[in-house]
Interface confidence: low
């Protein structure tokens, strides 16, 4: 079946079209062309001859046409009247004839479009825009890009006319976008340039920074203000009502307390016509001076004075602070706090509270500290300490005792031997003594600040035979499996050897006992009943030997397990029960009886006359140690049978 | 984030000297206590200089006294020890600590924020 073609269909002016024959039959006399759907000869564009070869225009011809032997219909520089069908007209040999038609479209050139706007400076949340695209085209599309993408859904954009105006209500600082139009027909497609949408907005609540609102006095004070506008803000500032300036930043150098107040900072947007503040409040604080301590007594008396020290100078609504030794106060009940913890008062001060002591002014921003003061306190003299801590001394050597005692003023020392003065010195140095120099050694201290004086008197004894040593003990009853004893040996003499026996022999090896201070002490550790034994000690030098008396040990120890006696459990009734309790014990323990857990007696016998089966039960004898502050018992079960 | 960062240490010959800075940051330098203090290998560490918030009180300990001088520069965030006459036994790691007013602090107590440590070695 004979058919046309139009390659293409759709046609841009100033283009060309093809209107293709398919299927042409064949033996022909030849084919014309006409514009529309039917063989009109006032419509003829080109007729053809095939035995000629002849084409011969019609009326329709418009010069643009040519035709092929094939009967193909080429047009060029199409115009838009060249739109509709095309008949082509054939005539066969045998004459007989036979039609087709095709079309096509002619569409324009679209050119750039651009896009116009109704509001170029749209106010946020007030005013509508409409964007129009630019020319209007008949058979065109319209297409809108944001921000080259697709319109994004939103009940605030609509579409009209065609799709050609983008109205945008009620606009937002968000619209501002990049916004393009694009054409598009069959034939071709175009896009505008961008339009950006200039909102106004704005301005927004200020935002003052720095946000700290409390400053030292002698700061300087710089704020910032910043609002979200379009166009941008123009600023005012003003402090306590009173307009300052017209600048973003308020600065005001070295500050006092009289620049506290209300800062407000204020936002216009020329366009827009609105104003926007946001209020700050500063307040400045006075630098608070360097504190100082003073006292009451420079001086004061270990154990007699009390000192008040005071934070220096007195200023309203501030906080005191105290620390002692760079920590904060401890607690005790020496040290008081006035009501407004001005003053700090040691009561009854000891040579502890030197301190330093360190007093603080504290307001909102800062703490500032005093110097560090040091209390001068006076104390002592102690009791002297006169060392070495021999007493016995061989003639021919030189005597150095030296004196010392805690003080405060340092003490003055005097020397007495027997009661008599003999020099105002720390140390007293005799040369080769002889057994003339024996007596009582005496140190007297001073402390001329506080009038006190301290003696200490110690025995020197001078010769060449070595004295009985006698044993010193630090405890005298010590409890078995509990305590320690230190046996020293005295006098502490130079030059001389210790030595110690137990029950007259050497000293065993045990790990209980140690020899400590040149062997003069003798500790017994964890001490046993065992221990309770009869200890001498020996003192030696090159000339001379001698042994103390011996010392025994009284070790407290039990009560032990008791034990009753007759072992007997049964008995015939009628008997006498004679039952005897005994524990090991140091000393002796108390004894006391229960029958089936009834008290009975506090000795150390039971006795029952002519028993019956009424005493069957068990018998329990109980014993205490109240030195040793441990108890001990036994139960017994006695049977009497009738 | 509040950060102390130490610098200025090194080897040194005994009887030279160096001077150790700290920048604070993150914090309100001015209303801040500063202390320096030191860590020997195999020792606790101990104190060595503070200085009060306003700068106007120092303390050093014993064994620094007149040799080292601590000091500060507000407008700088930064804490400085001058530290002259070096012996062999001041070789240590030395640390920069912030305490929040309060009274000085002679021990690590107190110290709410602490620096990394810059190392120190006096030998010949």
């Known amino acids: 079946k004979l058919t046309i073609e139009s390659t293409p269909f759709n046609v841009a002016e100033g283009k060309e079209v093809l209107l293709l024959v398919h299927n042409l039959p064949q033996h022909l006399f030849g084919y014309s062309w006409y514009k529309g759907e039917r063989v009109d000869g006032n419509r003829q564009i080109i007729g053809y001859v095939i035995g000629t070869q002849q084409a011969t225009p019609g009326p329709a011809y418009s010069g643009r046409e040519i035709i092929y032997p094939n009967a193909s219909l080429l047009i060029q520089n199409i115009i838009q009247n060249d739109t509709g069908f095309y008949t082509l007209h054939v005539i066969k040999s045998d004459l007989v004839n036979e039609e087709a038609t095709g079309q096509f479209r002619v569409y324009p050139e679209l050119p750039k479009p651009s896009i116009s706007s109704n509001n170029s400076k749209p106010v946020e949340d007030k005013d509508a825009v409409a964007f129009t695209c630019e020319p209007e085209t008949q058979d065109a599309t319209y297409l809108w890009w944001v921000n080259n993408q697709s319109l994004p859904v939103s009940p605030r954009l609509q579409l009209s006319n065609g799709n050609r105006t983008l109205t945008l209500f009620n606009v937002t600082r968000n619209d501002t976008a990049s916004y393009k139009c694009e054409t598009q027909n069959p034939v071709s497609a175009r896009r505008s340039d961008s339009v950006i949408l200039n909102v106004l907005y704005g301005p927004d609540a200020p935002t003052i920074s720095p946000l700290n609102t409390s400053y030292r006095s002698g700061e300087n004070l710089n704020l910032s203000c910043h609002a979200a506008s379009n166009p941008p803000a123009q600023y005012s500032w003003f402090v306590n009502g009173t307009f300052q300036q017209s600048t973003q930043e308020l600065f005001i150098p070295n500050i006092t307390v009289n620049n506290s107040g209300s800062y407000t900072c204020q936002a216009h947007n020329s366009d827009t016509g609105l104003n926007r503040t946001t209020v700050t409040t500063i307040t400045v604080y006075a630098e608070p001076p360097k504190p100082f301590i003073t006292s009451n007594n420079s001086n004061p008396v270990e154990d007699e004075d009390a000192v008040a020290l005071t934070c220096e100078p007195e200023i309203q609504n501030t906080t005191y602070l105290w620390w002692v030794n760079n920590q904060s106060l401890p607690v005790s009940p020496r040290l008081q706090l006035s009501n407004d913890n001005r003053t700090l008062t040691l009561l009854s001060v000891t040579r502890n509270d030197v301190g330093p002591y360190e007093c603080g002014i504290q307001n909102e921003l800062s703490v500032d500290h005093s110097d560090p003061v040091i209390l001068n306190v006076l104390y002592g003299p102690d009791d002297p300490t006169i060392s070495p801590s021999y007493t016995y001394y061989r003639p021919g050597v030189n005597l150095s005792l030296s004196c010392h005692a805690a003080s405060n003023p340092p003490a003055q020392y005097s020397w007495l031997i027997d009661g008599n003065i003999q020099q105002h010195t720390q140390e007293l140095f005799i040369s080769n003594i002889t057994e003339k120099n024996s007596g009582l050694y005496t140190c007297q201290a001073n402390n001329s600040a506080s009038g006190h004086s301290r003696t200490t008197v110690k025995t020197i004894t001078v010769s060449a035979e070595l004295p009985k040593p006698s044993i010193s003990s630090n405890n005298s009853k010590p409890v078995e499996d509990k305590d320690a004893v230190a046996f020293t040996c005295e006098p502490e003499a130079q030059n001389t050897t210790y030595l110690w026996w137990v029950n007259g022999q050497s000293l065993p090896v045990s790990p209980r006992l140690q020899l400590s201070n040149g062997n003069r002490t003798l500790t017994l550790f964890n001490v046993t009943r065992n221990d309770a034994r009869a200890y001498v000690c020996g003192i030696q030098n090159s000339v001379s030997a001698n042994r103390s008396d011996p010392v025994t040990l009284d070790v407290l120890y039990g009560p032990d397990t008791p034990i009753i006696s007759p072992p007997d459990s049964s008995y015939l009734s009628g008997a006498n029960l004679n039952l005897s309790c005994h524990s090991a014990s140091n000393p002796s323990p108390q004894y006391s009886w229960r029958i089936n857990g009834i008290p009975q007696q506090h000795t150390q016998v039971l006795f029952i006359a002519k028993i019956t089966p009424n005493n069957n039960g068990t018998y329990a004898c109980f014993v205490s140690n109240l030195a040793t502050g441990r108890n001990n018992s036994i139960v017994k079960s006695i049977t009497v049978s009738a | 984030e509040v950060q102390l960062v130490e610098s200025g240490g090194g080897v040194v010959q005994p009887g030279g000297s160096l001077r150790l800075s700290c920048a604070a940051s993150?914090?309100?330098?001015?209303?801040?206590?500063m202390g320096w203090f030191r860590q020997a290998p195999g020792e606790e560490r101990e104190f060595v200089a503070a200085i009060i918030w306003s700068g106007s009180n120092t303390y050093y300990a014993d064994s620094v006294k007149g040799r080292f001088t601590i000091s500060r520069d507000n407008a700088k965030n930064t804490v400085y020890l001058q530290m002259n006459s070096l012996r062999p036994e001041d070789t240590a790691l030395y640390y920069c600590?912030?305490?929040?007013?309060?009274?000085?602090?002679?021990?690590?107590?107190?110290?709410?924020?602490w620096g990394q440590g810059t190392l120190v070695t006096v030998s010949s």
């Open positions: 600590a912030a305490q929040h007013f309060g009274p000085i602090g002679l021990t690590t107590r107190g110290y709410h924020y």
């Open positions: 993150g914090l309100t330098f001015s209303t801040y206590t």
